[in-house]
Interface confidence: low
Amino acid sequence: SAPGEDEECGRVRDFVAKLANNTHQHVFDDLRGSVSLSWVGDSTGVILVLTTFHVPLVIMTFGQSKLYRSEDYGKNFKDITDLINNTFIRTEFGMAIGPENSGKVVLTAEVSGGSRGGRIFRSSDFAKNFVQTDLPFHPLTQMMYSPQNSDYLLALSTENGLWVSKNFGGKWEEIHKAVCLAKWGSDNTIFFTTYANGSCKADLGALELWRTSDLGKSFKTIGVKIYSFGLGGRFLFASVMADKDTTRRIHVSTDQGDTWSMAQLPSVGQEQFYSILAANDDMVFMHVDEPGDTGFGTIFTSDDRGIVYSKSLDRHLYTTTGGETDFTNVTSLRGVYITSVLSEDNSIQTMITFDQGGRWTHLRKPENSECDATAKNKNECSLHIHASYSISQKLNVPMAPLSEPNAVGIVIAHGSVGDAISVMVPDVYISDDGGYSWTKMLEGPHYYTILDSGGIIVAIEHSSRPINVIKFSTDEGQCWQTYTFTRDPIYFTGLASEPGARSMNISIWGFTESFLTSQWVSYTIDFKDILERNCEEKDYTIWLAHSTDPEDYEDGCILGYKEQFLRLRKSSVCQNGRDYVVTKQPSICLCSLEDFLCDFGYYRPENDSKCVEQPELKGHDLEFCLYGREEHLTTNGYRKIPGDKCQGGVNPVREVKDLKKKCTSNFLSPEKQNSKSN
């Protein structure tokens, strides 16, 4: 556990007066309807709020929307609806905010039935001004910005056309028809699937995967018989129909689709699916659904090529395609992921990995908690985390687990303590060491958020009654203060703080209800005066991540290196500040066999860390043979785990084997590829 100096709770001095001076109410001149909020840029303080209200008339529904803008983190709002000509904005498209600090915003308007195309409002100055543009098509999807150039937009039309703009939506060009799915890749590349015989649904499994690297001037067919495709890290994946039956296989490319290799993963049938759970430039977590309507599958982790996969976790909970999985990347500590498994008795249990999927284990029972009714042994049980699946099942869980990269080690989640997830009302738990140890933080369900890179945690009780109290902690959830932010309770709808957890402002959203009307209201609280001074060197302490045995020289080694962080002392009440950068000191570890995975043609017998050659590859066929190459497949049986930085120590290099003789069956023969220009 990260060091916690003060066990007793000291009160933050004069906090009521300090917070009262920094609490800003804004009542919106709106009927209730719905509200959506977007931050424009990073550290700009600009927030856009769109309220929409549908008035059902006898013959049709009349829509009204209003647009508000704040440039002080939500303390004050100005009605800017006139900038969009009082047009009704379609909420299903949301507000398309440009990448980075481009200051770009696109709003999609509702247009009357007979119009030739849709209408958008565009801003490139953080929503100070908007330009109305009529589209030559009706958009089916929200405008998608190229990650590399915010002037480049793409959208699909209701007629399945792929439209591209090179000047931030001023002019549009249809670059391809019959398009099912389109995504930006790197370097302004667009990948998309097309159908030939009628529709996306009818042609599923017979789609073609296309690429354009010049915004539609020229195209290249990079795959046929495609079911779907996805991008993750530097990997491009496609699931491809097999020649002879209805099964599909994953193929992977690391060169934008010029060349492909068959991933060493099981094929799936019509009712099954693949899902990329997480991906970075090193590796991929892939879920492969089990046959039948089981609700679970297997997680596999890839090598650095995305080709060779190791089984990581069995019975991984993932309901139908596009359904729910609890898979969560704990962003506050490297290598940590949490998810749920469906056990044989159909109970759901939480598992955690600290080494990027190498090993999974149950979460340690919090020391200040009792085992609940699900536990067979009242002294031995685990913490089980509520995530997307629990929320989808309408359990009393208002929020998914929360972690932030700049709040090192902190994980906050709803959970229950027992042998499995309980349907009883959950409590909120916190870990300050990336999931190794846990403490009950708050009794009952809450909304929560992290401010000032972990310097403040804010929470609001999840209640069906109106609320007027907020809780906050300056010591990573050990001690809590309560502040009454308004005399008149509101029906709470959400907490909003600037993404990135660097802000010290929190906005509480809700509505007031009186006999005749209900109105949107927000309260923005600035905690800057609670954290009166800037943090100094003495406020930080050294913390070794992943430390489980301080006596061990290799303590803290994960994926070949250990990291020491400077962590804010729990007892220090000071500002990390907006410019806070996580300070870490990495050191390389000696290699052990744990730093290597088994290459194709090799496996690890249970409870053995050595890779042993498979007797023959007949059952696995040629998919292990890289790039479809029928020769020169050499391996020493080991391959370093992606992202592993170990040096020295164990070097499992052995006699190099030539595996070409085991590659016996024929590959699907490449046919002529299609390239064309517009």
Partner: antibody
Framework: QVRLVQSGAEVRKPGASVKVSCKAS????????MSWVRQAPGQGLEWMGI????????SYAQKFQGRVTMTRDTSTSTVYMELSSLRSEDTAVYYC??????????????????????WGQGTTVTVSS | EIVMTQSPATLSVSPGERATLSCRAS??????LAWYQQKPGQAPRLLIY???TRATGIPARFSGSGSGTEFTLTISSLQSEDFAVYYC?????????FGGGTKVEIK
């Protein structure tokens, strides 16, 4: 513009090793495979092998298996070809060549061969006692 | 490995005439074939890829055709700078292999 610049001529005795470098510029190094091709005096072209700069994975012609090692340094956009246990018949000009389509893939209709579109100037290696 | 055979070994042609070079593969290479031109003391230069697509900057007098095992490179009207050695190369299956070359000389 796109260029491949190779290291200078080398003279080696039989049994020794030689390491030829090929520095790429003018394009994204990790996007293209690199092939090595050699040409003995008065003879035709002979493909030796290929390297994928992203992961460093390689594939060698059977004839050179065990004697050739291809590596890359992404920080300097350079690929290297080392040939060991040299014999007199290894006297040749060694070329690196950018190979956009890289290694054949098990993916139906996924590739048309693009050819080795950019070549280095060649490095003469002379093996003589 | 796939063996590539080029014919003829030498082709004598007058400037302005048409030259037809053949390349045969020992097994199908689909359209995974390229043609290169090499002049004395120089590195090879890519002419044709995908059996029939001209590489960037290659004049229209060069054309490629064929698929499977039989391929042809045609130079419609030979210019003085076209006298060189021409190689075909397959990339259907590793190892990549080249033909023995056809030398086009001035008649």
């Amino acid at each position: 513009q796109v260029r491949l610049v190779q290291s200078g001529a080398e003279v080696r005795k039989p049994g020794a090793s030689v390491k030829v470098s090929c520095k790429a510029s003018g394009y994204t190094f990790t996007k293209y495979y690199m092939s090595w091709v050699r040409q003995a005096p008065g003879q035709g072209l002979e493909w030796m092998g290929i390297i994928n700069p992203i992961g460093g994975s390689t594939s060698y012609a059977q004839k050179f298996q065990g004697r050739v090692t291809m590596t890359r340094d992404t920080s300097t956009s350079t690929v290297y070809m080392e040939l060991s246990s040299l014999r007199s018949e290894d006297t040749a000009v060694y070329y690196c060549a950018r190979d956009p389509s890289g290694i054949a893939a098990a993916f139906p209709a996924s590739r048309s061969y693009y050819g080795m579109d950019v070549w280095g100037q060649g490095t003469t290696v002379t093996v003589s006692s | 490995e796939i063996v590539m055979t080029q014919s003829p070994a030498t082709l004598s042609v007058s400037p302005g005439e048409r030259a037809t070079l053949s390349c045969r593969a020992s097994q199908s290479v689909s359209s995974n074939l390229a043609w290169y031109q090499q002049k004395p003391g120089q590195a090879p230069r890519l002419l044709i890829y995908g059996a029939s697509t001209r590489a960037t900057g290659i004049p229209a007098r060069f054309s490629g055709s064929g698929s499977g095992t039989e391929f042809t490179l045609t130079i419609s009207s030979l210019q003085s700078e076209d006298f060189a050695v021409y190689y075909c190369q397959q990339a259907r299956l590793g190892p990549w292999t080249f033909g023995g070359g056809t030398k086009v000389e001035i008649k």
